[in-house]
């Protein structure tokens, strides 16, 4: 019997009856065996077929068989009710081999030309199955030339049989106090050849309760207990199950905090599985009774292990554990049925003793030393020298534990120094001056830093002075030694202040005239205001009415006296304001350059001379009494004058402070 080509030779070719295309002879038998590679099949079709027709193709025929199965027995030219001719049909081997047998009997009634067929190997698509047949793969089937392979959805793994998908259903641990677990794919059929282990692991003290819910369907057997698929429940005390069949198992009260559920399936069956709802219970804790002025949240019928409650106090009350204040309180029920923390108290909020007010005092209004919720206190500033800034000083102890003003401020009120107070109540009768008495010029500041100069205290941490007096120290503010509160230049009993920063007017040019001869010194600490240390007021808008020609101003300082030495005691001089044109004219002649006196300056002194400020007085204040407020204000800053102090026809020249109020206010507010 002639053999067809065998793999690995190319598997395709042509078969024909003997003598084709001529007629075939009688008594012929020819057999072809075709073999394709594994995973392939053979396809065969006829391009010519002309065989003697006989009942059931008993005389001449072509038989196609694959393995033990006959695929077709063919004869004639066209199919009849009982005989089959191939026509345009294509025939496929069932496996990788195909046997073709041709046979002719002893006679032919007329000549027949036989057959011609073509064959080829082609890949089998194992993934395609006939309706009703079991699928090749459990989940996904992947065909390829010569074969196929199966794969599984996420959460499954391919069984070693290479077709079944076993569920990856082990290692799940449930730690919540209640929950649900079910067989994989529930309520759809559970997977085959799977072994699932679920753990419920609660904190010690809890007891797990299992309830089977909805439906239960696990493959069973009428005689043997769960031989195929089964569910088992194991605790540290006992084992429950195995369970199978269609009846919901009863509730299981495990009396254990750990449960292991095992579910095992075999390779067959189509069942929906099971669903368990689990809960837990524990020994209850005593019912919490809220403290006075407090309440419990949440309110529950009972509290068991891990349950918690919080205590919230009424407005104006705060949580206290012993004597310690708590931001919040939450107690947790423990396994032994006791709470982990004792009940706190709701104690009335105590704002505590109010902070001391710098330069002020505090008075208890509600009652002596009463500092609890809704208590009222009254701050006030030290009379005479301080006044309270934008605040009535009334503070209430609020629920947040802070003393709060009527405007809702939690910060202390501010006691601002009162400015312009002096022991000298009126202007009246340095160079040609008189000795100052205590409290006359409490704003007077002595500035030492290379030379002796002066300044005037503003507020309680600023000094107003002349730019030329502190120019050399503008980059080394700490070199300035600032003294106040003394009349004697050489007394050790002064109040020491130190400079934090020096601000020189940006329009001042050193050694090029004295326009904009103004500077501010910021002190590194506030000074205490008293009768010897009091700030000078800045001029009000209306101040010019007290600074007209011939109005009297007072200059003070430790500058040169008629004797040619710095004064040991603070001296002062009362001098009238000089008409601006008159002063300008006095300094138009040499050695003074034209334009020495600017609109930013004012002049003061006697035409006859003899009363003047002098070297060492620079930076000091020329002050005026505001008769409306009865406060002294700074109208000028000692700036420059003639080489010979107190010279007739020459005047002291002072920086006109009112021109610089915006500059002063900007610097003080910014720094």
């Amino acid at each position: 019997t002639p053999l067809g080509p065998k793999w690995p030779e190319p598997v395709f070719g042509r078969l024909a009856s003997p003598g084709f295309p001529g007629e075939y002879a009688n008594d012929q038998e020819r057999r072809w065996t075709l073999t394709a590679p594994p995973g392939y099949r053979l396809r065969l079709y006829f391009t010519h077929f002309d065989l003697e027709l006989s009942h059931l193709c008993e005389y001449d025929f072509v038989k196609l068989s694959s393995g033990a199965k006959v695929l077709a027995t063919l004869c004639g030219q066209e199919s009849t009710d009982t005989e089959r001719a191939p026509g345009k049909d294509t025939f496929y081997s069932l496996g990788s081999s195909l046997d073709i047998t041709f046979r002719s009997d002893y006679s032919n009634e007329k000549p027949f030309t036989g057959f011609e067929a073509f064959y080829a190997a082609e890949d089998i698509d194992e993934c395609q199955v006939a309706p009703g047949e079991a699928p090749t793969c459990d989940h996904h089937c992947h065909n390829h030339l010569g074969g196929f392979y199966c794969s599984c959805r996420a959460g499954y793994v391919l069984h070693r049989n290479k077709r079944t998908c076993s569920a990856l259903c082990s290692g799940q641990v449930f730690t919540q106090r209640s929950g649900e677990l079910s067989s994989p794919e529930y309520p759809r059929p559970y997977p085959k050849l799977s072994s699932c282990t679920y753990s419920i692991s609660l904190e010690e003290g809890f007891s797990v309760i299992l309830d089977f819910v909805e439906s239960f369907d696990v493959e069973t057997h009428p005689e043997t207990l769960c031989p195929y698929d089964f569910l088992k429940i194991q605790t540290d005390r006992e084992e429950h199950g195995p369970f199978c069949g269609k009846t919901l198992p009863h509730r299981i009260e495990t009396k254990s905090n750990t449960v292991t559920i095992t579910f095992v399936t075999d390779e067959s069956g189509d069942h929906t599985g099971w669903k368990i709802h689990y809960t837990s219970t524990a020994q209850p804790c005593p019912y919490p009774m809220a403290p006075p002025n407090g309440h419990v949240s949440p309110v529950q019928a009972k509290y068991i292990l891990k349950d918690s409650f919080s205590i919230f106090c009424e407005t104006g009350y705060e949580l206290l554990q012993g004597h310690l204040p708590l931001k919040s309180f939450t107690a947790v029920c423990q396994k032994d049925g006791s709470w982990d923390r004792p009940m706190p108290a709701c104690s009335i909020v105590d704002c505590g003793p109010p902070d001391d007010l710098p330069s002020g005092r505090v008075e208890y209004i509600t009652g002596p030393g009463v500092t609890t919720y809704k208590a009222v206190i009254q701050y006030s500033c030290e009379e005479t020298f301080y006044t309270m800034k934008v605040n009535d000083g009334k503070y209430v102890c609020e629920a947040d534990g802070f003393w709060t003003s009527s405007k809702g401020e939690k910060s202390l009120p501010v006691c601002e120094p009162v400015c312009g107070l002096s022991a000298r109540t009126t202007g009246g009768r340095i160079y040609g001056g008189q000795k100052a008495k205590p409290g006359d010029f409490p704003w007077q500041v002595l500035i030492l830093g290379g030379t002796t100069a002066a300044g005037a205290l503003l507020y309680d941490n600023w000094v107003l002075t002349a730019a030329h007096a502190v120019y050399e120290q503008k980059h080394d503010a700490s070199a300035l030694d600032i003294r106040m509160g003394t009349l004697k230049r050489l007394s050790p009993h002064y109040t020491q202040a130190w400079s934090e920063a020096v601000f020189i007017h940006e329009g001042y040019t050193h050694d090029a005239g004295f326009d904009n001869d103004i500077a501010l010194i910021k002190l590194n600490n506030k000074v205490v205001i008293n009768s010897n240390i009091t700030p000078i007021c800045l001029p009000r808008k209306e101040a010019e009415s007290f600074m007209r020609t011939d109005d009297i101003g007072t200059a003070s300082g430790w500058g040169l006296t008629q004797r040619g030495f710095l004064a040991r005691n603070l001296m002062y001089v009362d001098i009238p304001i000089v008409d601006h044109q008159k002063c300008t004219a006095a300094y138009e002649k040499p050695p003074y350059p034209r334009g020495s006196v600017t609109a930013n300056m004012l002049c003061a002194g006697l035409e006859s001379g003899g009363k003047d400020s002098c070297r060492g007085d620079s930076g000091g204040a020329l002050v005026f009494l505001d008769s409306e407020t009865e406060r002294w204000f700074v109208g000028g800053i000692v700036s420059w004058g003639s080489m010979n102090c107190g010279e007739a026809g020459q005047y002291g020249v002072y920086t006109k402070v009112i021109n610089y109020i915006p500059w002063i206010e900007n610097i003080i507010s910014d720094f």
């Epitope: 004697k488 050489l490 007394s491 050790p492 009993h493 020491q496 040991r568």
Partner: antibody
């Protein structure tokens, strides 16, 4: 040269008073503040107070406000310190010292030799 | 009142040693002053305004510091330097002294 010469040692009974003198020479007496300090046996230094010889302005620390009196005699350039109601714990060497006038004015550049005052019954 | 605490209270050193005495203030002080006192004698000014050497004081003495911590240093101890040293402040009224540091011969 600048010198401060103090009076000699004194022995006093409790309750009595003592007046220690300090004569200055070699400088303008009224230009410098005069300070008084004391040192108990084996102890540190303690400031009592000071006086301005130009006008007799005085300052005392709280502890000595009621018992110490500082005075000046300009004509003899002498400073005095009187301590009343003496107690045994007032036993000490008492110093006069000149205050500096060059920088801060708050230290002592010249000291007297000291006067030992013993208070004992 | 500002308290001044000197350390050590006493020390033993040899001629040629470098000696450092510290003075710690209970509050910040601007300037510190140092005095030397020998037995039976009045104190003598060594350092003023923290770091300035008083007239006639040898340059082996130096002062430094700021705020609450100040130091007197003797770079090379000489026989005549064995004495008690005091720090003094008057940044805050009243003026106060340290308790003293006694420098003895080892």
């Amino acid at each position: 040269q600048v010198q401060l010469v103090q009076s000699g040692a004194e022995v006093k009974k409790p309750g009595a008073s003592v007046k220690v003198s300090c004569k200055a020479s070699g400088y303008t007496f009224t230009n410098y503040w005069m300070h008084w300090l004391r040192q108990a046996p084996g102890q540190g230094l303690e400031w009592i107070g000071d006086i301005d010889p130009s006008d007799s302005e005085t300052h005392y620390i709280e502890k000595f406000k009621d018992r110490a009196t500082l005075t000046i005699d300009k004509s003899s350039s002498t400073a005095y310190m009187e301590l009343s109601s003496l107690r045994s714990e007032d036993t000490a060497v008492y110093y006069c010292a000149r205050g500096d006038i060059t920088t801060t004015l708050r230290y002592f550049d010249v000291w007297g030799q000291g006067t030992l005052v013993t208070v004992s019954s | 009142d500002i308290q001044l605490t000197q350390s050590p209270s006493s020390l033993s050193a040899s001629v040629g040693d470098r000696v450092t005495i510290t003075c710690s203030a209970s509050s910040s002080v601007r300037y510190m002053y140092w005095y030397q006192q020998k037995p039976g004698k009045a104190p003598k000014l060594l350092i003023y305004d923290t770091s300035n050497l008083a007239s006639g004081v040898p340059s082996r003495f130096s002062g430094s510091g700021s705020g609450t911590d100040n130091t007197l240093t003797i770079s090379s101890l000489q026989p005549e330097d064995f004495a008690t040293y005091y720090c003094q402040q008057w940044s805050s009224y009243p003026l106060t002294f340290g308790q003293g540091t006694k420098v003895e011969i080892k």
